[in-house]
């Protein structure tokens, strides 16, 4: 296993609709054809997997149908979007990139993007 540098923004505020996007950029040492991207969430010293996708270079990222993540790739950059976020989902979102094929296997883990989420103000009841 060889180490690889992964860069991501330090902090992002999600939209009022609970959507946060950020770029995860990796310094590919070779010509990988198969890449796996995993988003991990660290909160209160616990790390959980948010979503993961494996893609072939030049193709779209495919997350599971029920995933809260979507993404696109361009060269050594992956543009990740996480949806359905609520204030309780605030935390450090870490991008993990694995170059699966061809060998050698490379692994890179970013420093994390702190995503802050604000629950929208409830709309006041209105009588019509």
């Amino acid at each position: 296993c060889k180490a690889m540098h992964v860069a991501q923004p330090a902090v992002v505020l999600a939209s009022s609709r609970g959507i946060a996007s950020f770029v995860c950029e990796y310094a590919s040492p070779g010509k990988a054809t198969e890449v796996r991207v995993t988003v991990l969430r660290q909160a209160d010293s616990q790390v959980t997997e948010v979503c993961a996708a494996t893609y072939m270079m030049g193709n779209e990222l495919t997350f599971l149908d029920d995933s809260i993540c979507t993404g696109t790739s361009s060269g050594n950059q992956v543009n990740l979007t996480i949806q359905g976020l609520r204030a309780m989902d605030t935390g450090l979102y870490i991008c993990k990139v694995e170059l699966m094929y061809p060998p050698p296997y490379y692994l890179g883990i970013g420093n994390g993007t702190q995503i802050y989420v604000i629950d929208p103000e409830p709309c006041p009841d209105s009588d019509f």
Epitope: P9, V11, L13, S15, S45, L92, G112, T113
Partner: antibody, heavy 118, light 108 residues
Framework: QVQLVQSGAEVKKPGASVKVSCKAS????????ISWVRQAPGQGLEWMGW????????NYVQKFQGRVTMSTDTSTNTAHMELRSLRSDDTAVYYC???????????WGQGTLVTVSS | EIVMTQSPATLSLSPGERATLSCRAS???????LSWFQQKPGQAPRLLIS???TRATGIPARFSGSGSGTDFTLTISSLQPEDFAVYYC?????????FGQGTKVEIK
């Protein structure tokens, strides 16, 4: 090295607006947030809100909602904070601070004194 | 909103003495999101400690932070003349982010 340099002191009349700027250097501007904090004479630190430079999203303290606008110009690596309908109790030193991973305010501007007086 | 309460409001000590500053939060949160700042008259605040216990770059070893949950402490092991200042704790766990009201460390 990381630096945040703020605009100079301002004297304003009640009801007017003020726009304070904060020029960042020494780091990738879009990868961090910018927070604004004020300090009235002899008082403690009061957080006003912040802007996520990466996407332009903002979050303001309820007390300032509707009266404050925070923005950035990524071409000049500058953040702005505009406060409208100024009152005498808005007299304070206004600081910008860089927001990093885990929300840490790791670097601060030197402060801008805004005096509101008729 | 998480309310941060600092005590005491003023601490009168002599150079060389140990200073213990307390910060209490109205609700529990991860210590990763607790910072301490030092502010001297006419100057901007300066980050001392982040993550409740990690000293910022260039901060002397006499400054240490500890605590978890709702109770956090900043300790200055041996006060130097330049340490007499106001100290603030801050939480950035939940929006809105909040500061304590400050503790002034003054020369006795």
């Amino acid at each position: 090295q990381v630096q945040l340099v703020q605009s100079g002191a301002e004297v304003k009349k009640p009801g007017a607006s003020v726009k304070v700027s904060c020029k960042a250097s020494g780091y990738t501007f879009t990868n961090y947030g910018i927070s604004w904090v004020r300090q009235a004479p002899g008082q403690g630190l009061e957080w006003m809100g912040w802007i996520s430079v990466y996407n332009g999203n903002t979050n303001y303290v309820q007390k300032f909602q509707g009266r404050v606008t925070m923005s950035t110009d990524t071409s000049t690596n500058t953040a702005h904070m505009e406060l409208r309908s100024l009152r005498s109790d808005d007299t304070a030193v206004y600081y910008c601070a860089r927001v990093g991973v885990r929300g840490i305010f790791d670097y601060w501007g030197q402060g801008t004194l805004v005096t509101v007086s008729s | 909103e998480i309310v941060m309460t600092q005590s005491p409001a003023t601490l009168s000590l002599s150079p060389g003495e140990r200073a213990t500053l307390s910060c209490r939060a109205s609700q529990s949160f991860s210590s990763s999101y607790l910072s301490w700042f030092q502010q001297k008259p006419g100057q901007a605040p300066r980050l001392l400690i982040s993550g409740a216990s990690t000293r910022a770059t260039g901060i002397p070893a006499r400054f240490s932070g500890s605590g978890s949950g709702t109770d956090f402490t900043l300790t200055i092991s041996s006060l130097q003349p330049e340490d007499f200042a106001v100290y603030y704790c801050q939480q950035v766990y939940n929006l809105p982010w909040t500061f304590g009201q400050g503790t002034k460390v003054e020369i006795k």
